[in-house]
Amino acid sequence: ENSEQKENVEKEGLCNACTWRQNTKSSRIEAIKIQILSKLRLETAPNISKDAIRQLLPKAPPLRELIDQYDVQRDDSSDGSLEDDDYHATTETIITMPTESDFLMQVDGKPKCCFFKFSSKIQYNKVVKAQLWIYLRPVETPTTVFVQILRLIKPMKDGTRYTGIRSLKLDMNPGTGIWQSIDVKTVLQNWLKQPESNLGIEIKALDENGHDLAVTFPGPGEDGLNPFLEVKVTDTPKRSRR
Amino acid sequence: ENSEQKENVEKEGLCNACTWRQNTKSSRIEAIKIQILSKLRLETAPNISKDAIRQLLPKAPPLRELIDQYDVQRDDSSDGSLEDDDYHATTETIITMPTESDFLMQVDGKPKCCFFKFSSKIQYNKVVKAQLWIYLRPVETPTTVFVQILRLIKPMKDGTRYTGIRSLKLDMNPGTGIWQSIDVKTVLQNWLKQPESNLGIEIKALDENGHDLAVTFPGPGEDGLNPFLEVKVTDTPKRSRR
Amino acid sequence: DFGLDCDEHSTESRCCRYPLTVDFEAFGWDWIIAPKRYKANYCSGECEFVFLQKYPHTHLVHQANPRGSAGPCCTPTKMSPINMLYFNGKEQIIYGKIPAMVVDRCGCS
Amino acid sequence: DFGLDCDEHSTESRCCRYPLTVDFEAFGWDWIIAPKRYKANYCSGECEFVFLQKYPHTHLVHQANPRGSAGPCCTPTKMSPINMLYFNGKEQIIYGKIPAMVVDRCGCS
């Protein structure tokens, strides 16, 4: 009986790489979930509720476009040379929402928009496109709108705290608001080269009566209308020779 | 004992995908050999002796170049989309040696050079480069050589059987022979479009005294000096959706 | 060389690709904005000696040194990426490509 | 995630990549002009649950329907091509790329 038991143990040993208990659909899905988190370099699944997503998800053309192309699953994707990281996800577009910054707090303590925090992983020379998207509230009568994007700087001797990035003039008709994008590639590249120079920006979109139409801190019913930065990068996968 | 035997058989069945007898180096090499033939779309290994290779292998710059770069094994190779054939070998360069043709036989029965046979798999629009390489025997005194490549055509009413493809004039000094390449891309593309028009070519390389220096049928000690065609193709892998 | 496709009703015992859909909504991964689900597929079945053996690089070289290897396995021989749009938990939405997420073909390896 | 490299002296029992050279001259394949030999490598070793599991697309979905599958196998997870110069037996010399001829990485799949 003992030798039979031993023989069975040996057979089991021979098959240890081949028998997998609990081969169920759920265990297979669990394995894929672990994979995805690992490939995205996430330790755990981001803890974000449906409501938070509804609030944060920009209601803007770039998002629609990304969602509309999502099911084109198979791109011609380069297999990469031996040196390339063919395991981790590669990033093509980063959409960054504004966060709060001490420097942007006004005298009365009310925050000003906007400060964008960047990962040190984004290399300035990999930025292909950078656009600041802002939502302009609807107008009641036809009007010309003056959009101004200012960059915060350390206070100069004469008290200047801003320097212009972009300004544009556009006509608006009554109806729904519109999304407007502004090229900020050069500014972003400078911020990435010198992170300490990124103190934030101020957005103004004044109509002929001086009313600011730019949604900087969304009010009720304005979920998803925050300003955001759309950054397209060429992600040459990290070299990870093993 | 019978139930024990049955249990063992079941255990064996469970492991049938997992135990592989004769897991030796030679069996592994054999499997790789089968793979290579399959990937090259060859049913068996070409039956060619070392001597035959010595005779056939052109002693020309393109061959040296290919052999010199062979160990650059890992190119950035595209993974291909779902539709691409990522199993079979892709062809980049085809070196074709001349074969015999009935049409090229002279009245006295001595074959004329050269007839090149092409696979119907080569598509004319995939040809990037096509060069005819010819070897010119060494000369004893400095001389001008007139190289003429003629294309055979069906005899016309006036008896014309040739039409010119290329002619060039070059100076040769005493010493070793030289390899000369001639662009024949257009001719090759026409042959591929209309295979029936490929009746062969005649190569002439006359010095100032009318001696033909072109090696068309290698004599003793002239192994590897046959004319040959070097064709570079863009091999977009065959679509093989399953 | 090119892999069999099966479904849950197949009687095929040999190495085959079977459908499997990963539904992110079903397990509450709302942080993945798109796709909401995708077809991952999986490999299953028996491997005879050279059946469907695309990459014969698994079995042992030295019989005397088994190292627990399992011989030819039914495993993916071709995979493709998916594009994904997701929150990364840092106030950022990322659109990128994740390699080797879909099994296109199975074989014995 | 990224595969272990071993040699014939390794005591590693887990899934690992081992060296293997294919020598065309040694078995008389003179029709292959270049390379005369190349490093193919191979995979061998044991697979625990998620150890080195790069592509978790092999194990069964329905426990009730085993179909002879062998669970996680030590198998190539990254392969690369080689360029080859060879006679094709039709008076032609071909230079081309053969996909998936070198094992760059092994994993449990």
């Epitope: 053309p61 969602i67 509309d68 999502y70 099911d71 556009l170 519109i178 | - | 798109a34 796709p35 | -």
Partner: antibody, heavy 119, light 110 residues
């Protein structure tokens, strides 16, 4: 003044190619998606396709292979080209700002142009 | 293909009455809320009423409201006015560049 206006032939013969132009004013096509929608006489609305702010195109499944949408941002124009026209393609063709069903897309429409396909 | 079904095909009500129009999609719209409602009167282009399933478009009277999520949606006109006589269409977005309109509900005022 923000407007969209469709223009093109009123009558097209079967098998011919239809080319319609949507000319916009007060709209920057580099920031705005433009959609095409059609409506057969007495029938409902039918989505035809989109050209996105960034130039990507999305077509209804029935229109793939026959439809091309392009734009010339400098001329403020979006062009719809549909090959192999058939009498069933007789409809009023509209262009609209944005994408109906996404956000406030479809908040602004052209007046539409009636295209009749007949020999 | 995606099918969006609107019911009823025709709705005949008196001024001041409450109108309830239904729209059912054969598959869930993207993000559960990629759905808009349009009003169209004869000889005119459509007019946007509701987007994100429940958000009232600019300049649309508050008697119009939208509700629902996923596959089932409702447009409600709390108190019908004579000018509300029109055909109403729902439009759904599904991601992957797929969009569809319902076949429409005609609202008549008695």
């Amino acid at each position: 003044q923000v407007t969209l206006k469709e223009s093109g032939p009123v009558l097209v013969k079967p098998t011919e190619t239809l080319t319609l132009t949507c000319t916009v004013s007060g709209i920057d096509l580099s920031h705005t998606d433009i959609s095409w929608v059609r409506q057969a006489p007495g029938k409902g609305l039918e989505w035809v396709g989109i050209i996105s702010y960034a130039g990507k195109k999305y077509y209804a499944s029935w229109a793939k292979g026959r439809l091309t949408i392009s734009k010339d941002t400098s001329k403020n124009q979006v062009v719809l080209t549909m090959t192999n026209m058939d009498p069933v393609d007789t409809a009023t063709y509209y262009c609209a700002r944005g994408v109906p069903a996404y956000s406030h897309g479809g908040d602004l429409w052209g007046q539409g142009t009636l295209v009749t396909v007949s020999s | 293909d995606i099918v969006m079904t609107q019911s009823p095909a025709t709705l005949s009500l008196s001024p001041g009455e409450r109108a309830t129009l239904s729209c059912t999609s054969s598959q869930s719209v993207y993000h559960a809320n990629w759905l808009s409602w349009f009003q169209q009167k004869p000889g005119q282009p459509p007019k946007l009423l509701i987007y994100w399933a429940s958000t009232l478009a600019y300049g649309v009277p508050s008697r119009f409201s939208g509700s629902g999520s996923g596959t089932d949606f409702t447009l409600t006109i709390s108190s019908l006015q004579p000018e509300d006589a029109a055909t109403y269409y729902c439009a759904g977005g599904y991601g992957g560049g797929r969009y569809a309109f319902g076949q429409g509900t005609k609202v008549e005022i008695k």
